[in-house]
């Protein structure tokens, strides 16, 4: 069997000879050199060599426990002659003993940390950590203690944890923002002879809202023309705040003054300025000067600093309205007028009115924008604004006429304004009703009397207020002795009915029926339309089989015997 214990070796050996480790020995070894000891595993043949005859192991190089604390090797004892193992291959351990040869090393060369300004004493800032590569299980070589070398009286460090805390009350960022703290970590529990390392901690005080906004001046004055539309910026005011970020954000508001309803203030988020803008239309003729009280306040306030005073400030803003020559103003935004379609030329439709809003009250003249009335259907009295027709109208051609009227200051033609006129043409009964389509029908030779052969529909271009009411009748010249009758259905339709039993296409192949259509409006309008009726041979179901085509070439008019 093998005869050895665990081997121990001190790290960082500095002797000139190889460092003796120990001896591998089998109780089968007779000491006659017949056995060969072989070493394999971690570092065998390189770090560790064995005398193959004696089993003595030596370390050839300086070993560092921190690089590798344990080496696992395998031992064989073999008969030199046969190669036969006299023992089973066995594993053994060489354990490297620690010396204090490593200083504590911080996880970072430089730490960066932040802590709010005005923090209470003892507020946590950051924890620094140093590690010592030496053996923590043996002695104090890896027992680290922290101390502060630079950064007092502002900060302190907990010796065992490396936690850095604030040590001074009311540290003000606006006074000093950056601190450089140097921390030492020393092993051997901080005792004499311990090894040490240092790190730098760059600490930045972060801002808290401990400063109010302040206007640099108490009064501001701006001018704006009365023509400025709502939303127009008039001027900028700016309060300053010693804080930064959201703590320096400022909201502006108008709190008082006769311009409270006429102006707005909006906050420019980028520049933190208050922009005074026009809210409602200004009128120099009504009011020439406005005074506003504008307040600048922090939207985010920390209650614990309210004792320092209100986190707002106010300033007076004086706004002078400047006079502007303004164009005429129409009495309405748009005009809607009506006229009958049978109106004579020069008929007055209505009138428009415009006034110069300026104090001067300059007189105005009126004109029609000819781009909107190319056919010159309408005209205007340049002095009083009366609109009249200059051509005849037809509702059935155009129901609405949309034109533009221009009002121009006589003394300053550059000042003009425009207004839309919507003219509705009212209906007059000036169109007769007529057939909705061309009617061509047929009657079977064997038709019975009072048989409906066609329904008639009419159309009328007019648009009477109470709707269309058409009446239908045979023309007087065809009414007596007709072979067909017209039945008015009283619903704006009529039917053509047979008046006798049977028709002979060889006697009369085509009938032309003149039908009178009248409307019910004033004055009554009527027209006569002709219906062509062909006599056809039909099957017993009444389906047409054959007809003469002569009717198609007969001249329009009354056929004999219709």
């Amino acid at each position: 069997s093998w005869m050895w214990n665990q081997f121990f070796l001190l790290e960082e050996y500095t002797g000139s000879d190889y460092q003796y480790v120990g001896k591998l020995h089998s109780d089968q070894d007779r000491g006659d050199g017949s056995l060969k000891y072989i070493l394999s595993g971690d570092g065998a043949g390189d770090l560790f060599i064995i005398n193959e005859n004696t089993g003595d192991i030596q370390a050839t190089k300086r070993l560092d426990r921190e690089e590798k604390p344990v080496y696992i090797l395998r031992a064989q004892a073999i008969n030199r002659r046969t190669g036969r193992p006299v023992e089973p291959e066995s594993e053994f351990i060489i354990k490297i003993h620690d010396i204090n040869d490593n200083e504590p090393i911080f996880t970072k060369e430089v730490y960066t940390a932040t802590v709010p300004e005005m923090s209470d004493v003892g507020t946590f800032v950051v924890q620094v950590t140093a590690t010592d590569a030496d053996d923590p299980t043996y002695g104090n070589s890896a027992k680290v203690v922290y101390s502060i070398l630079q950064g007092q009286p502002y900060f302190s460090v907990e010796s065992e944890t490396g936690i850095i805390k604030t040590a001074l009350l009311n540290m003000d960022r606006e006074n000093r923002e950056q601190y450089q703290v140097v921390i030492q970590a020393k092993d051997m529990g901080g005792q004499m002879g311990g090894l040490s390392g240092t790190t730098t901690v760059n600490i930045t005080l972060t801002d808290v809202n401990d400063n109010p906004p302040r206007f640099p001046q108490s009064t501001y004055q701006f001018k704006t023309p009365e023509s400025s539309p709502p939303g127009t910026p008039i001027g900028r005011i700016k309060a300053s705040d010693a804080d930064v970020g959201e703590n320096a954000e400022i909201e502006y508001s108008i709190t008082d003054g006769e311009g409270l309803d006429m102006f707005d203030v909006i906050t420019d988020q980028e520049t933190q300025e208050g922009i005074i803008t026009v809210k409602k239309l200004l009128d120099f003729e009504k009011k020439k000067v406005y005074t506003l009280k504008v307040e600048a306040s922090n939207p985010y306030v920390e209650p614990r600093f309210l004792y320092l005073g209100p986190f707002k400030d106010s300033a007076t803003v004086r706004i002078v309205v400047e006079d502007v020559d303004e164009p005429p103003v129409f009495s309405k935004l748009a005009y809607i007028l009506q006229i009958r379609e049978d109106a004579q030329i020069n008929t007055t439709i209505g009138s428009v009115t415009a006034q110069d809003p300026d104090a001067a009250r300059n007189p105005v003249k009126y004109s029609v924008d000819r781009h909107t009335d190319m056919d010159r259907i309408f005209n205007i009295d340049s002095g009083n604004g009366s609109i009249f027709t200059s051509k005849l109208l037809d509702r059935e051609t155009l129901l609405w006429h949309n034109i533009t009227v221009i009002a121009t200051e006589i003394n300053n033609p550059k000042q003009s304004s425009r207004v839309p006129l919507y003219i509705k043409v009212l209906d007059v009964n000036d169109n007769a009703p007529e057939f909705a389509e061309f009617y061509e029908t047929f009657v079977c030779e064997k038709a019975k009397a009072d048989q409906l052969i066609q329904t008639l529909h009419a159309v009328d271009k007019d648009d009477p207020y109470s709707g269309h009411q058409f009446s239908f009748s045979l023309a007087p010249e065809a009414a007596s002795g007709s072979n067909f009758t017209i039945q008015d259905n009283k619903d704006n339709t009529a039917g053509i009915l047979t008046r006798k039993n049977g028709y002979n296409r060889h006697e009369m192949s085509t009938y032309l029926l003149p039908v009178v259509i009248s409307d019910n409006d004033y004055p009554v309008q009527s027209s006569t339309g002709t219906v062509t009726v062909r006599v056809c041979a039909c099957d017993h179901h009444g389906n047409m089989q054959s007809c003469h085509a002569e009717a198609l070439i007969h001249p329009t008019g009354l056929s004999t015997g219709a």
């Epitope: 006659d32 050199g33 017949s34 060969k36 073999i78 008969n79 030199r80 002659r81 046969t82 190669g83 036969r84 193992p85 023992e87 089973p88 291959e89």
Partner: antibody, heavy 117, light 111 residues
Amino acid sequence: EVQLVQSGAEVKKPGSSVKVSCKASGYTFSNYWMHWVRQAPGQGLEWMGDIDPSHSETHYTQKFKDRVTITVDKSTSTAYMELSSLRSEDTAVYYCARGDLGRFDYWGQGTTVTVSS
Amino acid sequence: DIVMTQSPDSLAVSLGERATINCRASESVSIHGTHLMHWYQQKSGQPPKLLIYAASNLESGVPDRFSGSGSETDFTLTISSLQAEDVAVYYCQQSFEDPWTFGGGTKVEIK
């Protein structure tokens, strides 16, 4: 470079003896066993015996125990194999070979011994 | 004595093909995980040359197309891709106990 150089070919009469030499170089002679192996014409290899040069300890196969003697001269790093009472079936090539952990890692070039009347 | 039996006696293999030689010992030649079986190559007119020791270890300078495996009584020498220069007689040998014995040899030729 390890080398094993053997003596030259021998022709012997039946009943006589032959002594073959093997000179070693390129390694520490006394650290390795020296073996002798023979090979009859067209036949396989046959281990005869070996010697530990440091202690002159020998091992022989039973077949040759009475006829073979293996010796060394440490001063010249030479091993010898003497075979007596030769007969015709001893005609063979005789090899010396260095032994290391049961294997023959270096061989001599071989010495042909012919036994003929 | 431990008797070593090699098979086959001869073997013809195409160039680039695998050649496998077996060796069986009459009793186990393994102890404590060490297999005391070695393989040699002998070319015509030359002394033998060590190829594989302790069943599976390649001797320094031997091409890696040669490999050995096995334990106890059954062992194998494999040439993964036969080359022209591999034509030879191959022997197995045990050093487990005296007398040390060789197999009868296997002759490898090109098909």
